[in-house]
């Protein structure tokens, strides 16, 4: 058993039919020594009396309040959850396995630049009951600060019968440098408590490998005289590192028909502008990468072609 | 230490070409070592980072742009004496920031070259013969020292008399190749803003 | 307007070979152009396209041919010739893409014998 | 991707009424475009769209269709019409002829 935060303990168990489970002995915070009983939940029932109560945790009906009391009056609170560990592995039921990049990813991070911000966020079925809270640090032996804000729902989805939720989190690195070449990698680690069932995630990563950088902005088409040609022009996303010479973007220009079976016209160059073939009912769609180091892709930035 | 923006014109500046082909050559050798390495631990997150030039240059402070050293966390108090003088430099304003910056890269490329002659020399002997050094990525590392020309000791090639032990060179090798591709990345940022300025 | 190919002529097996294609009255960099063949007696075979700079090849033709613009020429190079290559060689405009091809030159007669 | 054109030849009267078939292999949406060559001659785009008459066609010839199955009807065929015939498929990574069909004009 272990504090996960003031009053709240967490219980490590192994989760199989007839488990002995733990034996928890949990202390009334009072100078009180007599006349103290204790109960569970909202129950009156009492479990048992004195400044110490015994019990043996095997299942989710023995978590929860344990609350002790002297005359009516409340003394003191424990709150007992479980974390369920199934053929040696902590289970994962509060968040979806997202399967992007590898199988077994329940959280996924992105930043913008380089600039030590970072974005993560995750999915789960459960709509109620739920809380998350986050930590990060640059290192795990000596590790360097990340401070993240509180959890939010960003999104909702249905997906079939289910509706999907997605929550995410702003991270920044307290002293980052942008042209520094990282060589421990940011660790996130994510506490989930749904109900009496408590879970943690981790991911960790480098800034460099979780690029993703804003789509180019101001994209505008000039038709050359005479040609079915044009000349496309973009600039550099707002959020992207400066200076844009140390920090460059190499682009992908698409040329895309309205149907996904019309062949593409693909054009990569490190310049803001292209000259490409434009056509009737086909957009024009620009991505941007780092030039350097190949981290993902943006998203497009797309006009129509007429 | 920064790099201040009065550099050599854009296009007089040799190295960038060089730099370029140095991150492409690097890139695809390490993505070659993680394919033909596939059962060892190869790959970013399952090796340990480490930086050979760490205390001995300090390329990414001695190179950073003019814009970031308003930036407290850019700034670190590591000294390092370069030599000054290179054929990149292309330019009499050049200042001794610049050379300073050039000097480290040139240090750094003495110093992986070092490694990966010794380590190729001892991969040669590998009955297995599974894995060796791209020649290409060598002679890129050569081209690249040649463009920046700058005068300094010969560092003698490590040997070593006892019997190597191959699965821990290719780890080495691993390790190695990961740490100059983010050095050739590094290197290829400051050419790239050198060029432009 | 018009096309005309150029570069065909008599090799033997396993000699390269490139063939041209040129415009007048229009520019060939404003369309995607495509390269057809046609076997003596024989049916019309899609070789391979080039948009602005993306390429697409007929599974058949991947690797050993090449097809490449400038601003004034469209080629296509090939390689490993055999006797099955000897074909009268076409370049064509699209008019949209590949597939709707308004306007073709004459031809050029590629011979693959030894 | 694979066209399979059908008839490989067809026999009609002047006046008559042509009808050539072309079946893609897989939904190529209205990505076809039919041809007519003559002997010694380059080919000639007709149709294109599936359906579009290409300016200066004569309006005899018609396509129809789209998916995976194409129709190209000539209907009051004249001598001129003698020539063989080619549809033309495209999907996102490749271009495919049919087989061709002979018309001729008896």
């Known amino acids: 058993i272990w504090e996960l935060k003031k009053d709240v303990y967490v219980v490590e168990l192994d989760w199989y039919p007839d488990a002995p489970g733990e034996m928890v002995v949990l202390t009334c915070d009072t100078p009180e020594e007599d006349g103290i009983t204790w109960t569970l939940d909202q129950s009156s029932e009492v479990l048992g009396s004195g400044k110490t109560l015994t019990i043996q945790v095997k299942e989710f009906g023995d978590a929860g309040q344990y609350t002790c009391h002297k005359g009516g009056e409340v003394l003191s609170h424990s709150l007992l959850l479980l974390h369920k560990k199934e053929d040696g592995i902590w289970s994962t039921d509060i968040l979806k396995d997202q399967k992007e990049p590898k199988n077994k990813t329940f959280l996924r991070c992105e930043a913008k630049n380089y600039s030590g911000r970072f974005t993560c966020w995750w999915l789960t079925t459960i709509s109620t009951d739920l809380t998350f809270s986050v930590k990060s640090s640059r290192g795990s032996s000596d590790p360097q600060g990340v401070t993240c804000g509180a959890a939010t729902l960003s999104a909702e989805r249905v997906r079939g019968d289910n509706k999907e939720y997605e929550y995410s989190v702003e991270c920044q690195e307290d002293s980052a440098c942008p042209a520094a070449e990282e060589s421990l990698p940011i660790e996130v680690m994510v506490d989930a408590v749904h109900k009496l069932k408590y879970e943690n995630y981790t991911s960790s990563f480098f800034i460099r490998d979780i690029i993703k950088p804003d789509p180019p902005k101001n994209l505008q088409l000039k038709p050359l005289k005479n040609s079915r040609q044009v000349e496309v022009s973009w600039e550099y996303p707002d959020t992207w590192s400066t200076p844009h010479s140390y920090f460059s973007l190499t682009f992908c220009v698409q040329v895309q028909g309205k149907s996904k079976r019309e062949k593409k016209d693909r054009v990569f160059t490190d310049k803001t502008s292209a000259t490409v073939i434009c056509r009737k009912n086909a957009s024009i769609s620009v991505r941007a990468q780092d030039r350097y180091y190949s981290s993902s892709w943006s998203e497009w930035a797309s006009v129509p072609c007429s | 230490r920064n790099l201040p923006v009065a550099t050599p014109d854009p296009g007089m500046f040799p190295c960038l070409h060089h730099s370029q082909n140095l991150l492409r050559a690097v890139s695809n050798m390490l993505q070659k070592a993680r394919q033909t390495l596939e059962f060892y631990p190869c790959t970013s997150e399952e090796i340990d980072h480490e930086d050979i030039t760490k205390d001995k240059t300090s390329t990414v402070e001695a190179c950073l742009p003019l814009e970031l050293t308003k930036n407290e966390s850019c700034l670190n108090s590591r000294e390092t004496s370069f030599i000054t003088n290179g054929s990149c430099l292309a330019s009499r304003k050049t200042s001794f920031m610049m050379a300073l910056c050039l000097s480290s890269i040139y240090e750094d490329l003495k110093m992986y070259q070092v490694e990966f002659k010794t380590m190729n020399a001892k991969l040669l002997m590998d009955p297995k013969r599974q894995i060796f050094l791209d020649q290409n990525m060598l002679a890129v590392i050569d081209e690249l020292m040649q463009a920046l020309n700058f005068n300094s000791e010969t560092v003698p090639q490590k040997s070593s008399l006892e019997e190597p032990d191959f699965y821990k060179t290719k780890i080495k090798l691993c390790i190695l190749l990961h740490a100059f591709r983010i050095r050739a990345v590094t290197i290829d940022r400051v050419m790239s803003y050198l060029n432009a300025s | 307007q018009s096309l005309e190919e150029s570069g065909g002529r008599l090799v033997t097996p396993g000699t390269p070979l490139t063939l041209t294609c040129t415009a007048s009255g229009f520019s060939l960099s404003s369309y995607w152009m495509t390269w057809v063949r046609q076997a003596p007696g024989g049916g019309l075979e899609w070789i391979g396209t080039i948009a602005t700079s993306s390429t697409y090849y007929a599974s058949w033709a991947k690797g050993r041919f090449t097809i490449s613009r400038t601003s004034t020429t469209v080629d296509l190079k090939m390689t490993s010739l055999t006797t099955e290559d000897t074909a009268t060689y076409f370049c064509?405009?699209?008019?949209?893409?590949?597939?709707?091809?308004?306007?073709w030159g004459p031809g050029t007669l590629v011979t693959v014998s030894s | 991707l694979v066209m399979t054109q059908t008839p490989a030849s067809v026999s009609a009267a002047v006046g008559g009424t042509v009808t050539i078939n072309c079946q893609a292999s897989?939904?190529?949406?209205?990505?076809l475009a039919w041809y007519q060559q003559k002997p010694g001659q380059r080919p000639k785009l007709l149709i294109y769209?599936?359906?579009t008459l290409t300016s200066g066609v004569p309006s005899r010839f018609k396509g129809s269709g789209s998916g995976k199955q194409f129709t190209l009807t000539i209907s009051g065929v004249q001598r001129e019409d003698a020539a063989t015939y080619y549809c033309?498929?495209?999907?996102?990574?490749?271009?495919?002829f049919g087989g061709g069909t002979k018309v001729v004009v008896v």
């Open positions: 033309l498929g495209a999907d996102d990574t490749t271009t495919v």
């Open positions: 064509a405009r699209g008019l949209t893409t590949d597939y709707d091809l308004d306007l």
């Open positions: 769209s599936a359906s």
């Open positions: 897989e939904d190529i949406e209205s990505y």
